[in-house]
């Protein structure tokens, strides 16, 4: 694969990833289709830094991050290991809630409008970041 | 200057097979998603398909998914669309295009196209 | 899948004259949205992208407006050479939909 060193144009770089915001929402799927042509991937939450860092720039507004229970337990889509990882879950979440009476539960997680995380409806229109890291040969990612 | 050159297409058999390929030069090949797109006779423009930059990444149009494979060789500059069971309606004119940036950017370069013709 | 709508599928008009060709699309598609001119036996030309912004080394007298599911090419003041065929896309969502074309010709 090709190593990136530098972010793309409209990317922000940011300890040696790169994000990019987007200005509309689309459904998770949509959203992680968008960024994989991109050869990126749904936002990765590593750490309470880059917790800050993403919540900042997409100020109050809820937003997809790459981590999902679609197939059963949660996972992030670039496989960093969701048990032992950085979590910011709001209390009481995930509930996987069947309430909102849109089919099935709630697989799909996102930023919220405090920054903390919740799962929701996966078709849900929400804005998206996609991440990319650089001096990484880029590589296929790995399959839902 | 920034160029892409197709090649590959001619007359086959409806439930043949081609390979077109597009030669790109002028610009970090590898950096940039790239995009099949092909227009039947007399018709309009018709998306085929899309792969990312690192080849990781690959999209389909409907009418084509399941018999038409996109892919890449960064290190020769060259993007592939290969087709199998050609049908009389896949007959048109096949360009490669260059996305401005981003993937999802408009299509800033394209081929001069080749012409492919399903036909017994 | 968005699919594009454009109207006039096709359209007389004589130099001088201001021309408008619209472009709907079935969902919301932002600001990824572009026109293309295409002439015969050539390969298309990308005109405006994002929905507003001039490709460098367009004429001025093309301009793009519109955003979510309504867009608008709008041609000043035709020129000999702009009569050709223009065709809307959207690359917001793969598959990345053109609209069936505007036939552009002389009255």
């Known amino acids: 694969g090709s190593e990136r060193t530098c972010c793309p144009v409209n990317w922000v770089e940011h300890e040696r990833s790169c994000y990019w915001f987007s200005r509309s929402g689309k459904a998770w799927a949509d959203a992680d289709n968008y960024c994989r042509l991109e050869d990126a991937h749904l936002v990765v939450v590593t750490s309470w830094e880059e917790q800050k860092f993403v919540q900042h720039h997409i100020g109050p507004v809820n937003t997809w991050m790459g981590l999902h229970d679609q197939n059963g337990p949660w996972k992030w889509v670039d496989g960093t290991d969701y048990e032992t990882g950085f979590k910011n879950w709001r209390p009481e979440q995930p509930d996987d809630w069947y309430g909102h009476g849109l089919g099935g539960g709630e697989d799909c997680a996102h930023f919220t409008d405090d920054g903390r995380w919740n799962d929701d409806v996966c078709q849900r229109p929400y804005r998206w970041v996609c991440e990319t890291e650089l001096d990484k040969a880029s590589q296929e990612p790995p399959l839902l | 200057e920034v160029q892409l050159l197709e090649s590959g297409g001619g007359l086959v058999q409806p439930g043949g097979s081609l390979r077109l390929s597009c030669a790109a030069s002028?610009?970090?090949?590898?950096?940039?998603?790239m995009n099949w797109v092909r227009q039947a006779p007399g018709k309009g423009l018709e998306w085929v398909s899309a792969?990312?930059?690192?080849?990781?990444?690959?999209y389909y149009a409907d009418s084509v998914k399941g018999r038409f494979t996109i892919s890449r060789d960064n290190s020769k500059n060259t993007l592939y669309l290969q087709m199998n069971s050609l049908r009389a309606e896949d007959t048109a004119v096949y360009y490669c295009?260059?996305?401005?940036?981003?993937?999802?950017?408009?299509?800033?370069?394209w081929g001069q196209g080749t012409m492919v013709t399903v036909s017994s | 899948d968005i699919q594009m709508t454009q109207s006039p599928s096709s359209l007389s008009a004589s130099v001088g004259d201001r021309v408008t060709i619209t472009c709907r699309a079935s969902q919301y598609s932002s600001d990824y949205l572009n026109w293309y001119q295409q002439k015969p036996g050539k390969a298309p030309k990308v005109l405006i992208f994002?929905?507003?912004s001039l490709k460098s080394g367009v004429p001025s007298r093309f301009s793009g407006s519109g955003s979510g599911t309504d867009f608008t090419l709008t041609i000043s003041s035709l020129e000999p050479e702009d009569f050709a065929t223009y065709f809307c896309q959207q690359s917001y969502s793969t598959p990345f939909t053109f609209g069936q074309g505007t036939r552009l010709e002389i009255k």
């Open positions: 792969i990312s930059g690192s080849g990781g990444a690959t």
């Open positions: 002028g610009f970090t090949f590898s950096s940039y998603a």
């Open positions: 295009a260059k996305p401005l940036v981003g993937a999802h950017d408009a299509f800033e370069i």
């Open positions: 994002a929905a507003s």
